[in-house]
Every structure is written in structure tokens, then in C-alpha cells.
């Protein structure tokens, strides 16, 4: 779970060790603040749960790209 200290900076201290199905993901944001101990990605699921993930892992990168592509492609 992400942790907000002195909001609005949100940091991740641990990453999920489970691959999350992209069908469960709604959006993401990157955490790159120097106030945080490590770079991270926070996925928001379709039920509004936030999950910290390691941006170096392939499934995380692939999930971000999939979400970006969905955003760029107009729904017909």
C-alpha cells in the first residue's frame, strides 16, 4: 500500500510480489520524488485499490504500456 507522509508526496516502501491481471487495472501513476526511498508505480484497480509495483519489472512496464495504449485509442 502507498503511504502519504507530509502530503501530497506519496511513497512506496514495498512492492507487490504478485502479477496483477491488466483487466483489473484502471490507471497508474509514477512515483519519482527524491523524497521517496525508491522509484515506483502505483496502479489503481477497477475497485479503486492502490497497489505499489516495481517499475523495473516487465509485467509492470507492459501493463503501463497497455493502459497508455487504451487511453490513446478512442473507443468506437
Amino acid at each position: 500500500q502507498p503511504d502519504a507522509i507530509n502530503a501530497p508526496v506519496t511513497c512506496c516502501y514495498n512492492f507487490t510480489n504478485r502479477k496483477i491481471s491488466v483487466q483489473r487495472l484502471a490507471s497508474y501513476r509514477r512515483i519519482t520524488s527524491s523524497k521517496c526511498p525508491k522509484e515506483a508505480v502505483i496502479f489503481k484497480t477497477i475497485v479503486a485499490k492502490e497497489i505499489c509495483a516495481d517499475p523495473k519489472q516487465k509485467w509492470v512496464q507492459d501493463s503501463m504500456d497497455h493502459l497508455d495504449k487504451q487511453t490513446q485509442t478512442p473507443k468506437t
Epitope: 491481471s21 516495481d54 516487465k58 509485467w59 512496464q61 507492459d62 501493463s63 504500456d65 495504449k69 490513446q72
Partner: antibody, heavy 123, light 107 residues
Framework: QVQLKQSGAELVRPGASVKLSCKAS????????INWVKQRPGQGLEWIAR????????YYNENFKGKATLTAEKSSSTAYMQLSSLTSEDSAVYFC????????????????WGQGTSVTVSS | SIVMTQTPKFLLVSAGDRVSITCKAS??????VAWYQQKPGQSPKLLIY???NRYTGVPDRFTGSGYGTDFTFTISTVQAEDLAVYFC?????????FGGGTKLEIK
């Protein structure tokens, strides 16, 4: 059939830049990543970076940040890698290789490779 | 970066022999390991993905196994055309990294 066709050999001066190309055919260009891999003569393989043409998102090996810049042109299904401030250490064969997405279900490793482009840096 | 330590560096074998190559990752990479074959003057060719899945058209004499940190690639019956360098590669965590390669030579 899937093909990745790379541009021809380059002989470049130290300090110069070079832009290599990788033209894809036989599949939907925006559905797969293009990776770039370096191989020095008689040496192993070193992954440089990858680009997802569907979004333009790039992921770099830290060792090549500032050295390599990846771009992709959807209209021509062509991926590019620019190498800057060249030195003799950059003399190598550079391969492009396709890989799928783990979340879409078309991932099988780097399943198709270009023929390689030889870059020689010499004055 | 994850280091992939591949052994041995060289293998001198006779046609018909069974050979195994091992790759040890410096940390767990799940099953995100591929094996490639590179013949002299050619591009690498994918043989195995997800540690144990044989790629389309790859002969069944090539097999892969392993999970976590320890991986093995086996050729059950070496043939003359298997003369090549073989590489393992992880793509669990960026940067993707390769083993140093194993040069297979036929007696």
C-alpha cells in the same frame, strides 16, 4: 511472414552520431516491442533498450542512457536507434529484435531478430 | 542489475551426446528466462521462452527447465548443425541481461 530489416553497415568518426533503422513487416507494428541489443566482436550480448511503438514509451539500460535514443515511426513501421558521441567502445554489431507483451498474451521472448548492423568507429 | 552466470563457457562434444548448460541468476527471476542459439555470422535465434517453453518450430531435442535462480538448457542428442553459441537471458527485471554464452563445438 514477420521480418525485421536493418540498415546497412556504418563507418563513423569518433565523436559523431549515427542513426540505425529497423523496418518491420508481416505483423502489427504497434502491438509488439522493439528491443536493441549490442554485440561486440567475439563477445556476448548486451541489451540496450526497448520501445513500444503503440505508445512511444521507452525503457533503457542505465548503461546506455545518454548514449542511445530510441524512436519509432508508426506510418512506416520503422524503429530507430540513434547513438551519440561515438567512441571505439561503440564499435559493434547492433541487432533489433521483436518481443510481445506479457499482458496481451503475445509474449514469447525476443522471437524475431534483424540481421544486424555493423558500426565501426574509426578516425 | 541481475547477473546471469552461465556455465560452462565451452563444450566439446560428439554427435549423439547429451549436453546441459546451466544459468544461475543473482536473484530470483521467476520463470522469465529465455535461451538463444547464435550460429557463426548469424543473428541469435529464440529456442526457449518462459524457462521451459519450446518456441515454434524448435526441435524437441532442445529443452529448458528451472525456476527462481537456477536454470538448465539441455540438448538430448547433439547434431552437427547444433554448433553454435548458446545464451540464457532474463527479462524479469530491467535491464534485461544475458549470460556470457556457451560455445558448443563438435568433435
Amino acid at each position: 511472414q514477420v521480418q525485421l530489416k536493418q540498415s546497412g553497415a556504418e563507418l563513423v568518426r569518433p565523436g559523431a552520431s549515427v542513426k540505425l533503422s529497423c523496418k518491420a513487416s508481416g505483423y502489427t507494428f504497434t502491438d509488439y516491442y522493439i528491443n536493441w541489443v549490442k554485440q561486440r566482436p567475439g563477445q556476448g550480448l548486451e541489451w540496450i533498450a526497448r520501445i513500444y511503438p503503440g505508445t512511444g514509451n521507452t525503457y533503457y539500460n542505465e548503461n546506455f542512457k545518454g548514449k542511445a535514443t530510441l524512436t519509432a515511426e508508426k506510418s512506416s513501421s520503422t524503429a530507430y536507434m540513434q547513438l551519440s558521441s561515438l567512441t571505439s567502445e561503440d564499435s559493434a554489431v547492433y541487432f533489433c529484435a521483436r518481443s510481445g507483451s506479457t499482458v496481451v498474451g503475445n509474449y514469447y521472448g525476443m522471437d524475431y531478430w534483424g540481421q544486424g548492423t555493423s558500426v565501426t568507429v574509426s578516425s | 542489475s541481475i547477473v546471469m552466470t552461465q556455465t560452462p563457457k565451452f563444450l566439446l562434444v560428439s554427435a549423439g551426446d547429451r549436453v546441459s548448460i546451466t544459468c544461475k541468476a543473482s536473484q530470483s527471476v521467476s520463470n522469465d528466462v529465455a535461451w538463444y542459439q547464435q550460429k557463426p555470422g548469424q543473428s541469435p535465434k529464440l529456442l526457449i521462452y518462459y524457462a521451459s517453453n519450446r518456441y515454434t518450430g524448435v526441435p524437441d531435442r532442445f529443452t529448458g527447465s528451472g525456476y527462481g535462480t537456477d536454470f538448465t538448457f539441455t540438448i538430448s542428442t547433439v547434431q552437427a548443425e547444433d554448433l553454435a553459441v548458446y545464451f540464457c537471458q532474463q527479462d524479469y527485471s530491467s535491464p534485461w541481461t544475458f549470460g556470457g554464452g556457451t560455445k558448443l563445438e563438435i568433435k
